[in-house]
């Protein structure tokens, strides 16, 4: 990944972190009626060798990790990304001010892994 | 963000990069008979606002990008990860020195996206 952290910040292993998102903070309060926000969560952390079972790593991620160890300046570590996502239902105003109930897919992180 | 960039440079968007992996370099030449290596590829690049259609972003990634803009020190950008992976067939020796032909899933990156 293109992100660089200070050497003093030791990153923990890839995992799910809790994150509540307020639609008001996003400036969406005028068109989203409900909910007021939701537990979106996010993934963060290191995908370092060895990738254990908790990291839900793909075969490619395992290979990439080994190549990164051999060639760290050119091949990055795999990144920590969602492996399971859930939908949420949102009540909102459409462009014609109709009230719509819609299910939005892939909104909530349920699990993370190395990819 | 904790990243250091040259302000004059544009960040490169999340995309697939070519990578050939040699099984000899991985030290696997004694048990993998064929192929000698394969085009594994990898994903790298920025998942920055706005996430365009090429970035195959999930709804969660779009929300996370907006939250990152509001709170960059605590919520990272989404990461650039494989969205499509292919299998490869490998001819190898098992623990009993039998020759096995096996299809290994999720070995080759075909496409990348922001997750």
């Amino acid at each position: 990944s293109a992100s660089d952290y200070n050497s003093s910040e030791l990153k923990t292993a890839c995992r799910k972190h809790e994150l509540y998102v307020s639609f008001q903070d996003l400036g969406w309060q005028d068109w989203i009626i409900a909910p007021k926000g939701y537990a979106a969560n996010y993934c963060d952390g290191e995908c370092s060798f060895p990738l254990n079972a908790h990291m839900n790593a793909t075969n490619h991620a395992i290979v990439q990790t080994l190549v990164h160890l051999m060639n760290p300046e050119y091949v990055p570590k795999p990144c920590c990304a969602p492996t399971k996502l859930n939908a949420i239902s949102v009540l909102y105003f459409d462009d014609n001010s109709n009230v719509i109930l819609k299910k939005y897919r892939n909104m909530v992180v349920r699990a993370c892994g190395c990819h | 963000s904790a990243s250091d960039y040259n302000s004059s440079e544009l960040k490169t968007a999340c995309r697939k990069h070519e990578l050939y992996v040699s099984f000899q370099d991985l030290g696997w030449q004694d048990w993998i008979i064929a192929p000698k290596g394969y085009a594994a590829n990898y994903c790298d690049g920025e998942c920055s606002f706005p996430l365009n259609a090429h970035m195959n972003a999930t709804n969660h990634a779009i929300v996370q990008t907006l939250v990152h803009l509001m709170n960059p020190e605590y919520v990272p950008k989404p990461c650039c990860a494989p969205t499509k992976l292919n299998a490869i067939s490998v001819l190898y020796f098992d623990d009993n020195s039998n020759v096995i032909l096996k299809k290994y899933r999720n070995m080759v990156v075909r496409a990348c996206g922001c997750h």
């Epitope: 370092s48 300046e73 050119y74 | 960039y5 040259n6 690049g45």
Partner: antibody, heavy 121, light 111 residues
Framework: QVQLVESGGGLVKPGGSLRLSCAAS????????VHWVRQAPGKGLEWVGR??????????MYAAPVKGRFTISRDDSKNTLYLQMNSLKTEDTAVYYC????????????WGQGTLVTVSS | QSVLTQPPSVSGAPGQRVTISCTGS?????????VHWYQQLPGTAPKLLIY???ERPSGVPDRFSGSKSGTSASLAITGLQAEDEADYYC???????????FGGGTKLTVL
């Protein structure tokens, strides 16, 4: 043949600034990750920092002693690497080398001859 | 103090074999990262001697060999020659941030 030539070293007072350059030739500069490494008189090698390629968003990273004071940049059109050094301290006195990273195992396969930076009042 | 630990000096007579150790930790060599070795002759820039633990760039004699085990690596020089007198450095990466780390250097004296 592959060549890296540093320039811009010299005598500077504590708190001063200096910009080092590293001119590359004999290879496709834009395809390589490049680093700065320094060596204080009579001491060992100390990593300063690096800059990645365009494909990795020219990401930079720095060693703790120089972070926030030094900035690495590159101009691929000029095949040149730069090290901008600000708020210099006496302990920054060293020979500064630029080094190219080979692309299969990430070793520093080519080094410049070095340029001496002396920080003294 | 360097992240990787090397003996400050080693010596040997011409024709002998010497080894230089490089001890790291679980966050660098022990994390699986490659180890490289550099030779620095007096008054010159360092030169890549061994890369990826045990591979030699073209032009490096096969008298030089490298190995790695656990959190340590070593450089072996057989058939010692007067021109081998130099400083030798090991180098790897720190796993948490992919920062480059060097050993403190070892001065080889050919007696």
């Amino acid at each position: 043949q592959v060549q890296l030539v540093e320039s811009g070293g010299g005598l500077v007072k504590p708190g001063g600034s200096l910009r080092l350059s590293c001119a590359a030739s004999g290879f496709t500069f834009s395809s390589y990750v490049v680093h700065w490494v320094r060596q204080a008189p009579g001491k060992g090698l100390e990593w300063v920092g690096r800059i990645k390629r365009e494909s990795s968003s020219y990401t930079t990273m720095y060693a703790a002693p120089v972070k926030g004071r030094f900035t690495i940049s590159r101009d691929d059109s000029k095949n040149t690497l730069y090290l901008q050094m600000n708020s210099l301290k006496t302990e920054d006195t060293a020979v500064y080398y630029c080094a190219r990273v080979e692309r299969s195992k990430s070793g520093f396969d080519n080094w410049g001859q070095g340029t001496l930076v002396t920080v003294s009042s | 103090q360097s992240v990787l630990t090397q003996p400050p000096s080693v010596s040997g007579a011409p024709g002998q074999r010497v080894t230089i150790s490089c001890t790291g930790s679980s966050s660098n060599i022990g994390a699986g990262y490659s180890v490289h070795w550099y030779q620095q002759l007096p008054g010159t820039a360092p030169k890549l001697l061994i890369y990826g633990q045990s591979e030699r760039p073209s032009g490096v004699p096969d008298r030089f060999s490298g190995s790695k085990s656990g959190t340590s690596a070593s450089l072996a020089i057989t058939g010692l020659q007067a021109e081998d007198e130099a400083d030798y450095y090991c180098q790897s990466w720190d796993s948490s941030q992919t920062l480059v780390v060097f050993g403190g250097g070892t001065k080889l004296t050919v007696l």
